[in-house]
Interface confidence: medium
Amino acid sequence: RAPRCRELPAQKWWHTGALYRIGDLQAFQGHGAGNLAGLKGRLDYLSSLKVKGLVLGPIHKNQKDDVAQTDLLQIDPNFGSKEDFDSLLQSAKKKSIRVILDLTPNYRGENSWFSTQVDTVATKVKDALEFWLQAGVDGFQVRDIENLKDASSFLAEWQNITKGFSEDRLLIAGTNSSDLQQILSLLESNKDLLLTSSYLSDSGSTGEHTKSLVTQYLNATGNRWCSWSLSQARLLTSFLPAQLLRLYQLMLFTLPGTPVFSYGDEIGLDAAALPGQPMEAPVMLWDESSFPDIPGAVSANMTVKGQSEDPGSLLSLFRRLSDQRSKERSLLHGDFHAFSAGPGLFSYIRHWDQNERFLVVLNFGDVGLSAGLQASDLPASASLPAKADLLLSTQPGREEGSPLELERLKLEPHEGLLLRFPYAA
């Protein structure tokens, strides 16, 4: 008799793929544009990335550091009108892209939460949640919550409003903290909260360190759903050298939880190459004319246009990973088991019941390494086969689809491998 199938877990939409943050509409659109109507024209691009949600804004009226002139119910006219927003929501819905609105109140000011008027601000947020839920948004984001006094209790209240409206609505909180205890204390009182933090931001040094950070986090959070990013708002290039971007894309897409990216992460957008551009929100490089301040500074391989035409580009890798992440059961909600693979390496298995299984091996080092996969670390339900098919490598030159002997696995510097193998009873 065939073994009984494992019951599928309840999956919310944010469990099914990546979220894409557009914190600065003007920087994202460039060329003197930067409004909701223009963003609507970029939804096809977001669809091509297979992202499940767009984290937008803040776009509300906010006069720097002035509570009275901050209105969370009003869209800043520079970004467009409520009608433009409604139209964007409708178009996004047609493309199965959910819209999450950032309501961080004082986003133009010094302290995001007007430290001296917490209660006034909290009331404004409550009213805004109700207003925008009625308007049809799929969720909310609030950032810099380390600056919000009694953050846990406010988040619990806002979560109740959001979930009270519909279980299908999401609340994301962002913090600059990288301290696990602080992160856990925020999560404790908020069951379904998705939290973005700087927890992984110093993980770039070694495979062992990254493995330890990831496993500590997963062990500490138990079976709750996580999100994975390197910060609450900034680009991957703020933390990582170019040679590690592919590796991190592979990791973020294959860890158990929701990967969260900022616009430009998919092309390796780097403010450092664009003098005068703010580190936190450089102009998006759609093509070579997107950064006119220095003609010739932008080469085709740095842009969406150039990378779209190159199957070996970072953007192409992002699209492939995003696609896999959204359709493979083992990546959608599979179990996770990390195991030893030798110094400098981080490896893990994702598996769900009798579905195809995935092995991820990541070499964070700058030298080639032979992987010594320690299958003995794994439970019986997640045993390794002798061979697995190469689904993709972060480096060019490997023949995809070819079976690799796991005992003889060698990785190039900064190489990540995604391998697949079937369930064996």
Partner: antibody, heavy 119, light 113 residues
Framework: EVQLVESGGGLVKPGGSLRLSCATS????????MSWVRQAPGKGLEWLGF??????????EYSASVKGRFTISRDNSKSILYLQMNSLKTEDTAVYYC??????????WGQGTLVTVSS | DIVMTQTPLSLPVTPGEPASISCKSS????????????LAWYLQKPGQSPQLLIY???TRESGVPDRFSGSGSGTDFTLKISRVEAEDVGVYYC?????????FGGGTKVEIK
């Protein structure tokens, strides 16, 4: 042929104001970034700032040494670039050049206009 | 601000002979993303406005004679004149456009011996 002609220089007292103009011809003014660069007598060159083109909303960038005192603007209907200088100091004495940019390096330069700040 | 330092201050040259000017920046002008050095060179002839010679550290502006060449990477750059001509006299400046504010070197005065 691209032409840039500065005017408006002269003698001004410390604390005073002056507006320099740069009349341009030979190119489509709204399509180009425009900069101001100055040169103190017998000294080197100093970039003051630029104003972007129409496609980039005519936004500006300034050097810290003049930010808040100097303002770059443009009259696109007349193809004229301006430099409004307030709270002038003796160290602002220099030849002021307007340039048409590419935009981080400076391809076309005017002949310059001398500003002397002295009591 | 990035400080640009040029040497020598003054360079007496013989027509027909080569000449070389050095420019050092206080931080690297090389961007890893595009492997370009954000540096330009200018010549200001006596009584005239400056004219652009080189950008991207080594790309000659159109119309500039091929006896002028730029080289270097990171923080150390050089402008070479393969065979100096009388019309090459003046003050040479390097300029970085790696970050705001754009800054120039102090200049190198090239004169005929």
């Amino acid at each position: 042929e691209v032409q840039l002609v500065e005017s408006g220089g002269g003698l001004v007292k410390p604390g005073g104001s002056l507006r320099l103009s740069c009349a341009t011809s030979g190119f489509t003014f709204i399509d180009y970034y425009m900069s101001w660069v100055r040169q103190a007598p017998g000294k080197g060159l100093e970039w003051l700032g630029f104003i972007r083109n129409k496609a980039n909303r005519y936004t500006t960038e300034y050097s810290a040494s003049v930010k808040g005192r100097f303002t770059i603007s443009r009259d696109n209907s007349k193809s004229i670039l301006y430099l409004q200088m307030n709270s002038l100091k003796t160290e602002d004495t220099a030849v002021y050049y307007c340039t048409r940019d590419r935009p981080a390096w400076f391809v076309y330069w005017g002949q310059g206009t001398l500003v002397t700040v002295s009591s | 601000d990035i400080v640009m330092t040029q040497t020598p201050l003054s360079l007496p040259v013989t027509p027909g002979e080569p000449a070389s000017i050095s420019c050092k920046s206080s931080q690297s002008l090389l961007y890893s993303s595009n492997q370009k050095n954000y540096l330009a060179w200018y010549l200001q002839k006596p009584g005239q406005s400056p004219q652009l010679l080189i950008y991207w550290a080594s790309t000659r502006e159109s119309g500039v004679p091929d006896r002028f060449s730029g080289s270097g990477s990171g923080t150390d750059f050089t402008l070479k004149i393969s065979r100096v001509e009388a019309e090459d006299v003046g003050v040479y400046y390097c300029q970085q456009y790696y970050s705001y504010p754009y800054t120039f070197g102090g200049g190198t005065k090239v004169e005929i011996k």
